[in-house]
């Protein structure tokens, strides 16, 4: 529980968190460790989320070895017409899960974002909203002539692939590679999900990289000029590192950003790339992640419905990736 | 750029009221709180209170009740700080200022002399 | 709820400055130091204990733990001469500290 003996970490490598839980150094710099979320227990090796501004309330006596993660004290946020107090969490709406954290609001989904890759059992693979559900779902819609499902597996709907390209089918295994899904964050550190099969067992398998559509800080509509109903991608801003779970990037970036529209349009990445980011971690370890590098930005009324002040920034394709 | 803009210093006599503005710029004036901060000179900085942007309710801190009044004025994306029956200790800067991640943003400030 | 911070504080050019700023379990909470020059309005320089606002330079540093919450300046130079002041949140209320006059030598 506490730190006075050596360092002793499992063998196995870091432990993977779930969505939205930090991965961090425990208490005693020893093992990097699954953050304690809000309202769980910690102890000096099992730190509290730093990112969520939580930390271990021990209570009294102060020198009890078991705390309870609670959020820091700080500033309220307005959101929607209701004052959130800094650590409380809300549901803005059925999709978004939303936290306030002294005094700005970040959300994340809590509607998955897969992709899924025609098969031949579901060659047509459809996200429709079904009646009382929140989420979206998966259909497969049945050809109406069975000698087509063939061919089928080649026609992609040009939201969710690129291919296919006639080079891409090997022996036995047709390569396809869906777009990397939108950033799972509205501003600030993010992930991107693809689904390829292009390895050598033509297996599928998920990749992933971080994204940052826009910093949390910037203060984007500061930059719209009078008479202009939009910035899609500001002016590159000075050189800057990233963070990622109190790692920080070894290099700095002039990362490009997308800008806001304030005419009821989204603006999100159009072109991106993706390349390796080296983290410097406190404990020295460095770690290499592949990240999007956006190109441009584009501003488009393909929002989807129901007014959610989220909906016009996920679940939109990022088209033209270069990896 | 994102600003604050406040309305000229003020000399009042004791027991006049004065309006003080401040007036936004350069974001989305309702999705953050504006803040009322006092300066007598020479001394440190004390907080007043805050208003809603989105819903115009105001909190006042202890001691700045009853003769404080903080409103807004949507359509021109501007706070007033109003002071009935001036006193001479009321004589400060005020500032207003934005909060976000910490007060972010400041007024220049407005200086409200009091006269007896 | 209060936050005590030393009236003044001197350091050489070149030097490293330690402003303190205590609190009971200030830890608990974030906080914020602003800088104020004369005639000038505050300027925020560390926010959520340990974090700098993009423009700040990064010869400030804070730090937050137990009962006291310190902003550092390493390199301290004559343009860093000003009060600062600490503040942090209790409940929903801002509470601001008596602020420390800093003297570069």
């Known amino acids: 529980q506490n730190c006075s003996g050596p360092c002793r970490c499992p063998d196995e490598p870091a432990p993977r968190c779930p969505a939205g839980v930090s991965l961090v150094l425990d208490g005693c710099g020893c093992c990097r460790v699954c953050a304690k979320q809000l309202g769980e227990l910690c102890t000096e090796r099992d730190p509290c989320d730093p990112h969520k501004g939580l930390f271990c309330h021990f209570g009294s006596p102060a020198n009890r070895k078991i705390g309870v993660c609670t959020a820091k004290d700080g500033a309220p946020c307005i959101f929607g017409g209701t004052v959130y107090r800094s650590g409380e969490s809300f549901q803005s709406s059925c999709k978004y899960q939303c936290t306030c954290l002294d005094g700005a609001v970040g959300c994340m989904p809590l509607c998955s974002m897969d992709v899924r890759l025609p098969s031949p059992d579901c060659p047509f693979p459809r996200r429709v909203k079904l009646p009382g559900k929140c989420c979206e779902e998966w259909v497969c819609d049945e050809p109406k002539d069975q000698t087509v499902v063939g061919p089928a597996l080649a026609a992609y709907r040009l939201e969710d692939t690129f291919g296919p390209d006639p080079t891409m089918i090997r022996a036995n295994c047709l390569v396809q590679t869906t777009e990397w899904s939108a950033c799972s964050k509205t501003c600030g550190m993010g992930i991107s999900t693809r689904v390829t099969n292009d390895n050598a067992s033509c297996r599928l398998e998920k990749q992933s990289r971080l994204c940052m559509v826009r910093p949390c800080e910037a203060d984007l509509e500061e930059n719209i000029k009078k008479g202009k109903k939009c910035i899609r991608t500001p002016k590159i801003s000075k050189p800057i590192k990233f963070e990622l779970s109190g790692c920080t990037s070894m290099k700095t970036y002039r990362a490009k950003f997308c800008g806001v529209c304030t005419d009821g349009r989204c603006c999100t990445p159009h072109r991106t790339t993706t390349l390796p980011v080296e983290f410097k971690c406190p404990d020295g370890e460095v770690m290499k992640k592949n990240m999007m590098f956006i190109k441009t930005c584009a501003c488009h009324y393909n929002c989807p419905g129901d007014n959610d002040i989220f909906e016009s920034l996920y679940y939109r394709k990022m088209y033209g990736d270069m990896a | 750029e994102v600003q604050l803009v406040q309305s000229g210093s003020e000399l009042k006599k004791s027991g006049a009221s004065v309006k003080v503005s401040c007036k936004a710029s350069?974001?989305?004036?309702?999705?953050?709180?504006i803040h009322w901060v006092r300066q007598a000179p020479g001394q440190g900085l004390e907080w007043m209170g805050w208003?809603?942007?989105?819903?115009?309710?105001?909190t006042y801190a202890q001691g700045f009740t009853g003769r404080f009044v903080f409103s807004l004025d949507t359509s021109v994306r501007t706070a007033y700080l109003q002071i009935s029956s001036l006193k001479a200790e009321d004589t400060a800067v005020y500032y207003c200022?934005?909060?976000?991640?910490?007060?972010?943003?400041w007024g220049q400030g407005t200086m409200v002399t009091v006269s007896s | 709820y209060v936050l005590t911070q030393p009236p003044s504080v001197s350091v050489s050019p070149g030097q490293t400055a330690s402003i303190t700023c205590s609190g009971d379990?200030?830890?608990?909470?974030?906080a914020s130091w602003y800088q104020q020059k004369p005639g000038q309005s505050p300027v925020l320089v560390i926010y959520?204990?340990?974090k700098r606002p993009s423009g700040v330079p990064e010869r400030f540093s804070g730090s937050n733990s137990g009962n006291t919450a310190t902003l550092t300046i390493s390199g301290t130079q004559a343009m860093d001469e000003a009060d600062y002041y600490c503040?942090?949140?209790?409940?929903?209320?801002?509470?601001f500290g008596g602020g420390t006059e800093l003297t570069v030598l």
């Open positions: 200022a934005r909060v976000r991640y910490g007060m972010d943003v």
């Open positions: 503040q942090a949140w209790d409940s929903n209320t801002v509470v």
């Open positions: 350069g974001y989305t004036f309702n999705n953050y709180a």
């Open positions: 208003i809603n942007t989105n819903t115009g309710n105001p």
């Open positions: 379990n200030l830890r608990s909470k974030y």
């Open positions: 959520q204990d340990t």
